[in-house]
């Protein structure tokens, strides 16, 4: 009886098992019982990354600099181009189809995790004893100045956005 299923790296066509084309090659013509599957290498800027029966190779991804993208890894006949973002930007999706600027942490918040090529900045509110008075994508919350270590006293209490203000000891005391 004709086959109803085929081995790995084969496909069923016209009641016959034909070899799939290897990664980096596309299908030109199906096998017959007299000749094997005819495959051709993908052209420049094309790829196929699996054993396949595709009649057209896929185009390599274009890393559009207008979208903040650059090439992280050049594509081959078997792999797609991998894009990443320019410094200071990160991908908007796993596929990295476009980039956005890293989000800065506003005053009162500091950087808990710095942004990467694929993730945005993670901010945290500055806890008591810490402050941030700038909008930054890399500054952490800074500890309030310790007036005591400078032989000074607190003249104005700190907040999550401002440092304490130190002043001289009251000389009358």
């Amino acid at each position: 009886e004709p086959p109803t299923a085929c081995r790995e790296k084969q496909y069923l066509i016209n009641s016959q098992c034909c070899s799939l084309c290897q990664p980096g090659q596309k299908l030109v013509s199906d096998c017959t019982e007299f000749t094997e599957t005819e495959c051709l290498p993908c052209g420049e800027s094309e790829f196929l990354d699996t054993w396949n029966r595709e009649t057209h190779c896929h185009q390599h991804k274009y890393c559009d600099p207008n979208l903040g993208l650059r090439v992280q890894q050049k594509g081959t006949s078997e792999t797609d181009t991998i894009c990443t973002c320019e410094e200071g930007w990160h991908c908007t999706s796993e596929a990295c189809e476009s980039c956005v600027l890293h989000t800065p942490c506003i005053p009162g918040f500091g950087v808990m995790e710095m942004a990467t090529e694929t993730t945005d900045t993670v901010c945290e509110p500055c806890p008591v004893g810490f402050f941030s008075n700038v909008s930054s994508a890399f500054e952490k919350c800074h500890p309030w100045t310790s007036c005591e270590t400078k032989d000074l006293v607190v003249q104005q209490a700190g907040t999550n956005k401002t440092d304490v203000v130190c002043g001289p000891q009251d000389r009358l005391r």
Partner: antibody
Framework: EVQLLESGGGLVQPGGSLRLSCAAS????????MSWVRQAPGKGLEWVSG????????YYADSVKGRFTISRDNSKNTLYLQMNSLRAEDTAVYYC??????????WGQGTLVTVSS | DIQMTQSPSSLSASVGDRVTITCRAS??????LNWYQQKPGKAPKLLIY???SLQSGVPSRFSGSGSGTDFTLTISSLQPEDFATYYC?????????FGQGTKLEIK
């Protein structure tokens, strides 16, 4: 024991026709692709035509396309080659062969076709 | 069609010799190549399939190698019954095509 026996060869005038037969025995004929291969006197082998198993497709060399027709009768375990519009360059020994995994593992003894006026 | 070119066209050798016949395809055929042996007045016999696999019943002194466009048939130690004509045949593209043959004669 696998056996292939060709018949139907002979002398024919240019433009004439002949039908070759190949009687198969010793195997399940319908399960195998079959082909015809020819060999002109003192020359090499030339694949002429093939027919798939289970009534599969038919295939021809460019040199015979449109003139030769391959067919099979699985109920009679017989392969045929209908040859029309014969030319002097078709003169050859014609072999039928069984196909397995893209190779011809069993061949008949051949039948001689002579095209001459 | 794919052209198959064998070399040499003929060669003389002695019993016990190691003999190599080459076959070149006009374009890449991966490992889709068979070798046949034909003796005068007889039908061809399949020796090697898929470039390097020995057909059942064929002596192990016969071996095949190669892929892409260049292939070889090697007989490690010639026996008297090996004097014959050898043909390569590709099945990478339709139609299947044969080389012109290599005639192996006794020296």
């Amino acid at each position: 024991e696998v056996q292939l026996l060709e018949s139907g060869g002979g002398l024919v005038q240019p433009g004439g026709s002949l039908r070759l037969s190949c009687a198969a025995s010793g195997f399940t004929f319908s399960s195998y692709a079959m082909s015809w291969v020819r060999q002109a006197p003192g020359k090499g082998l030339e694949w002429v035509s093939g027919i798939g198993s289970y009534g599969g497709g038919t295939y021809y060399a460019d040199s015979v396309k449109g003139r030769f027709t391959i067919s099979r009768d699985n109920s009679k375990n017989t392969l045929y080659l209908q040859m029309n519009s014969l030319r002097a360059e078709d003169t050859a020994v014609y072999y039928c062969a069984r196909y397995v995994n893209f190779g011809m593992d069993y061949w008949g003894q051949g039948t001689l076709v002579t095209v001459s006026s | 069609d794919i052209q198959m070119t064998q070399s040499p066209s003929s060669l003389s050798a002695s019993v016990g010799d190691r003999v190599t016949i080459t076959c070149r395809a006009s374009q890449s055929i991966s490992s889709y190549l068979n070798w046949y042996q034909q003796k005068p007045g007889k039908a061809p016999k399949l020796l090697i399939y898929a470039a390097s696999s020995l057909q059942s019943g064929v002596p192990s002194r016969f071996s095949g190698s190669g892929s892409g466009t260049d292939f070889t048939l090697t007989i490690s130690s010639l026996q008297p019954e090996d004097f014959a004509t050898y043909y390569c045949q590709q099945y990478g593209r339709n139609p299947p095509t044969f080389g012109q043959g290599t005639k192996l004669e006794i020296k």
